[in-house]
Interface confidence: low
């Protein structure tokens, strides 16, 4: 495939990445799948600057990101190292709370209304943000 040099229609370019902001809600796994079908991934936040950019666009609404601990340790969907990377959890979070009565704990991370992160039940239908890197090879065949 060829290298993507500009963002698709309705995506927002920022710092060599393209972002798409949903206006509806899906469970985390469905949001993750949506982004993959767009040759993208749920947003991976690697800096305070990127955090502020995403926060500006989503407003004060619960929104999924590409961070989960469904298999034990916290992991970013694109393989970015969690332990050494940027974090912006709310105080006392993540807490893997079991008191919600929905079964299990809380394995998926989302932006809360003030931008900081919380872990929540992955089935909740929150908005989501997809991200893809401009320098990444696109799956589309090159134009001949």
């Amino acid at each position: 495939g060829s290298e993507r040099t500009c963002c698709p229609v309705n995506w927002v370019e920022h710092e060599r990445s393209c972002y798409w902001f949903s206006r509806s809600g899906k469970a985390w796994a469905d949001a993750d799948n949506y982004c993959r079908l767009e040759d993208a991934h749920l947003v991976v936040v690697t800096s305070w600057e990127e955090q502020k950019f995403v926060q500006h666009h989503i407003g004060p609404v619960n929104t999924w990101m590409g961070l989960h601990d469904q298999n034990g340790p916290w992991k970013w969907v694109d393989g970015t190292d969690y332990e050494t990377g940027f974090k912006n959890w709310r105080p006392e979070q993540p807490d893997d709370w079991y008191g919600h009565g929905l079964g299990g704990g809380e394995d998926c991370a989302h932006f809360t209304d003030d931008g900081r992160w919380n872990d929540d039940v992955c089935q909740r239908p929150y908005r989501w943000v997809c991200e893809t890197e401009l320098d990444k090879a696109s799956q589309e065949p090159p134009l001949l």
């Epitope: 926060q55 105080p91 709370w97």
Partner: antibody
């Protein structure tokens, strides 16, 4: 247009109870953290309690912990504050406010605790 | 708990003056700071959140700056409707706390 309207204020005797309501409109209520803030007439602002969307997280000021209960009914777009064991120092105007940065406020409900 | 202080506690100014109010947090709060305006008998009104983001509909003569522990609210050219009490508030951690307020009155 975002609107928050409090009701349920009034005069109550020390030790009594009162339930405040806040009716919300103009936004997707269930997605937002909601708060109660109070203000003694002529004094400053004091945060009372917060409840996150889906009621997952609830917080109280130490001054009301164990006496006040915050709750919400997302189907009714309503926020509540159940106030028990009321004291003279709880006399204040009570405001509901949206999100943790309090971007929108109701007009307030006066609660007077006096014998 | 995070303590918030404001200075001055009151100030007298004239229409057209530039006014600045400072707010200090007892520990770092990044940019999780809001400013409110309150007039007698009315509910507070949000002016600024995230230290510098102007709330929709707020006139551009209001501006906010700062990060960490020190913050400033500025009014570039005071208008008659700006005479009020101004509060800062941290929403970095619970319990959320407000500054004691700064009353701006007519000189």
């Amino acid at each position: 247009e975002v609107q928050l309207v409090e009701s349920g204020g009034g005069l109550v005797k020390p030790g009594g109870s009162l339930r405040l309501s806040c009716a919300a409109s103009g936004f997707t209520f269930s997605s937002y953290t909601m708060n109660w803030v109070r203000q003694v007439p002529g004094k400053g602002l004091e945060w009372v309690s917060s409840i996150s969307g889906s009621s997952t997280y609830i917080y109280y000021a130490d001054s009301v912990k164990g006496r006040f209960t915050i709750s919400r009914d997302d189907a009714q777009n309503s926020l509540y504050l159940q106030m028990n064991s009321l004291r003279g120092e709880d006399t204040a105007v009570y405001y509901c406010a949206r999100v943790t940065s309090f971007d929108y406020w109701g007009q307030g409900a006066l609660v007077t605790v006096s014998s | 708990d995070i303590q918030m202080t404001q200075s001055p506690s009151s100030l007298s100014a004239s229409v057209g003056d530039r006014v600045t109010i400072t707010c200090r947090a007892s520990q770092g709060i990044n940019n999780y700071l809001a400013w409110f305006q309150q007039k007698p008998g009315k509910a507070p009104k949000s002016l600024i959140n995230a230290a510098s983001s102007l709330q929709s509909g707020v006139p551009s003569r209001f501006s906010g700056s700062g990060s960490g522990t020190d913050f400033t609210l500025a009014i570039s050219s005071l208008q008659p409707e700006d005479f009020a009490t101004y509060y800062c508030q941290q929403y970095y951690s619970y319990p959320f706390t407000f500054g004691p307020g700064t009353k701006v009155d007519i000189k």
